[in-house]
Structures are given as structure tokens and as C-alpha cells.
Interface confidence: low
Amino acid sequence: FVRTKIDTTENLLNTEVHSSPAQRWSMQVPAEVSAAAGDAAVLPCTFTHPHRHYDGPLTAIWRAGEPYAGPQVFRCAAARGSELCQTALSLHGRFRLLGNPRRNDLSLRVERLALADDRRYFCRVEFAGDVHDRYESRHGVRLHVTAAPRIINISVLPGPAHAFRALCTAEGEPPPALAWSGPALGNGSAAVPSSGQGHGHLVTAELPALNHDGRYTCTAANSLGRSEASVYLFRFHGASGAST
């Protein structure tokens, strides 16, 4: 399921281009596209240009992060007169042109979405041959990747004064709320320790003092689901183990 939010579209005049009044350079992209991790998303991008019936060589490019300077994630080239844009770059093989640049459509499909794909993308078209011109979307399209929580690390570490502390790190979008439960904490304790902190899609919560032996469970929850992982503390046996 892919949701496209078309709040704003770009219709930016490239003042460097001497164009007929009929058609100017412009690019139309949605403000945001939202899709779930693991799914595919389509990033729409269509354009107009001032070069009537241009049929020469062209290159279509998508970059991530920032316009003009961000790393390219996709690039293809079409020979003169050809409807086929030959892929020259597809990062990790997950990017595929869905549109046809010859028909003013640069729409891109991104397969197997990951949270790391949550960023802004910019489409660009370059004409070569008898016409030399290029244009790139300035605002781009934000790809919003949603994901149910996943606990990526849970561990018990030595703390001050021979105490132990526990760390739980989870990822998800929206960023999940973390809660610890365990001996003397009460079951299903919803209180996230004040040391909980987020970095992008990652959230970490620390349980600063494990005062009792037993099983400590970290629960991560957001609007899309929940995930649990546990660690066991056995101080008298001189070891601690983790089980997920």
C-alpha cells in the first residue's frame, strides 16, 4: 500500500533557459510519498520543457539527500529516438524507472524499502545532442517509510559499584515508545526511563540499575505494532544472558 500526499507541486521556472512562452521547464512531484518498510513505493515525477518535440539523447537521474549534489541512486540513458531508457545505475538494484522520459515521465519505483530509505529524492533530466539542457527538481519528494517496531539490541552491561544496567535499542517509524518490565518494576511498566533517547528511527532506553535477579523485558510499541525482547540477570552465577 503506497500513499501519495500531493500537498504541493513544483513548477519552477529555470531562468537560465530561453523558452517559448508555451512551455517552460517545470517539474511536478508530490510533497511526500508514504509506504511501509519491505514494500515498494513509487516516486512520481513529470516534467515539461521548452524544446518542442525533442527526440535526441537524454539522461534521467534520481539523487537522494539534496538537489544537485546528493548521491545518485538511479541513472538511465536513452539514445536518439529511443523509447527505452537503459539503466546505468540502480543502487543495490532496488531502483527502477516506471515512467518513460520520452513521455515526460521520470517516475521511479523503489523496491524492498528500508527505514534508511526515508529521505528526500530529486529527479533530474538532461538533454544532449542538438539541444544541451538540464533541469532538476529543487524541493524533491520526501519518501516517508513507516515500520513496526523492531528491537535491534538488548544487553546487560556492568554499571557502577558492581551494579548492572540494561540497554534496549529499537527502530521503527513512528519512533516507538520503549517500556521496561521486570522484577520489582511491575509488569508492563509503561514508564520509559528518562535516559530514553532517539536518533532518527532509533530509540534507546536504559534501565540504570538492575537490583534483582530475573527476567527483564523491553517492549517497543508504535501505531503499527509492538515487539518484545528479554534479558536474564543471574548475578549469583556470575553470568548474564540475553534471549530474544
Partner: antibody, heavy 130, light 107 residues
């Protein structure tokens, strides 16, 4: 000779499903995009759907989006149109037609040119009626 | 979607007359336009592609012209076999819309 032959038409009740087939012969099926075009009785031509030569791109008219599915089996030289939730207004003669051709050199696609729908089948009639 | 408007809807002509059919697109489609001929009970036949390129085997009395939004199909001297219905079709966008058709009748 080069030809396309449609089949699978018939009379069906509203809300039911039907699958049309189009068998190609006389040309390299896997190098051509193929369309479905329909024509209601006494009316003009109405584009329905297209599928690229390798099945990678599929496009639909708004009127059939989410109800019809185009597919192809290049090993069988066959095109399909799965029609679900049929309506009275889907009553028409359905044609398959081939479009522009790709050019391959040593197994690598180097070009794709569109030259209109140059070969058409004879059509198969679909009637949606209760 | 791009709308294609043909005119006239019906055209009466005599054998040998010069006939012109017009097709207008609701937005610029470059030269991505095809013309088809259809006879009753038969499948359409491609005449012209890329606005002015003559399909192989089509008589030279048929010609196409135009670009952008205005296109014409001309039959320089219609023969009895040419009296049929003609359709234009754009393939600039992936909703390959047809015009509503022009029926060429014998006067």
C-alpha cells in the same frame, strides 16, 4: 503470417469475471508491447490497457483500473486480460493489438521504438447483462 | 488524461475529392499521434504513426501532418475503398486516448 487471435469472450452477468486471451503467431512476441482496446456497439475505440514486452510495465484506463489485470506469458506467446467486477458498460468487442518493437543486439536491448498499433486481432465480444 | 477531439464527426465526399480530417489534443503531445482506418465489423488498420510517417503498405494518397496539439489526416484523392471511419490516437501519455472518430461517407 503475422496475426493475433483473441478468445474468451461471452455473455456474463454484472459483477462476475471473465478472462480473455490473445495468442500471437508469425512474429517474436517477446519483443513487442501489447494493448487491449475495446469498442462498444456503435461507438468509437476505447483504449483499455498495455503491457510492455517483458511484462515490467502495465498501464490501465481509469475506467478499468483496479478491476482489470493485464498479463502475458512470453513462453506461450499469449496475452491475457482478467476482467473482474464486470459492468454493463464493459460490453464491447475487445481487440488485442501489438505496439512498438524493441531491438536486441547479442541479447541486450538497445532500443525501443513506438510505431503505433500495427497488428490487430479480429476481436472477441464481451456482453455483460443480467 | 489527454483528450483528443476530431472534426468533423461525419464527412461527405465524392471519389477523387481532397479530404482533410482534423484532430486536436487537449495538451501538447509532440508528434506522438497515429491515425487508423476502420471498416464496419473489422479491426482498425494503422495508416500513419509519428504524426506523418506512412505505415508500410498504405497508399501514398494518405498523409499526416501537424505537431503539438493540431494534426490533420489528408486523403488526396479518396477511392471507393477509403470510405470508412478514421480515428486519431495519442501515445504521449500512458492513457493512449483515441479521438471519437470521423465517418467518411460517399456523397
Amino acid at each position: 503470417q503475422v496475426q493475433l487471435v483473441e478468445s474468451g469472450g461471452g455473455v456474463v452477468q454484472p459483477g462476475r469475471s471473465l478472462r480473455l486471451s490473445c495468442v500471437a503467431s508469425g512474429f517474436t512476441f517477446s519483443t513487442y508491447g501489447i494493448h487491449w482496446v475495446r469498442q462498444a456497439p456503435g461507438k468509437g475505440l476505447d483504449w483499455v490497457s498495455v503491457i510492455w514486452y517483458d511484462g515490467s510495465h502495465k498501464y490501465y484506463a481509469d475506467s478499468v483500473q483496479d478491476r482489470f489485470t493485464i498479463s502475458r506469458d512470453n513462453s506461450k506467446n499469449t496475452l491475457y486480460l482478467q476482467m473482474n467486477s464486470l459492468r454493463a458498460e464493459d460490453t464491447a468487442v475487445y481487440y488485442c493489438a501489438r505496439e512498438g518493437m524493441i531491438t536486441m543486439v547479442r541479447g541486450v536491448i538497445i532500443d525501443y521504438q513506438y510505431h503505433g498499433m500495427d497488428v490487430w486481432g479480429q476481436g472477441t465480444t464481451v456482453t455483460v447483462s443480467s | 488524461d489527454i483528450q483528443m477531439t476530431q472534426s468533423p464527426s461525419t464527412l461527405s465526399a465524392s471519389v477523387g475529392d481532397r479530404v482533410t480530417i482534423t484532430c486536436r489534443a487537449s495538451q501538447s503531445i509532440g508528434r506522438r499521434l497515429a491515425w487508423y482506418q476502420q471498416k464496419p465489423g473489422k479491426a482498425p488498420k494503422l495508416l500513419i504513426y509519428k504524426a506523418s510517417s506512412l505505415e508500410s503498405g498504405v497508399p501514398s494518397r494518405f498523409s499526416g501532418s501537424g505537431s503539438g496539439t493540431e494534426f490533420t489526416l489528408t486523403i488526396s484523392s479518396p477511392q471507393p475503398d477509403d470510405f470508412a471511419t478514421y480515428y486519431c490516437q495519442q501515445y504521449h501519455s500512458y492513457s493512449y486516448t483515441f479521438g471519437q472518430g470521423t465517418k467518411l461517407e460517399i456523397k
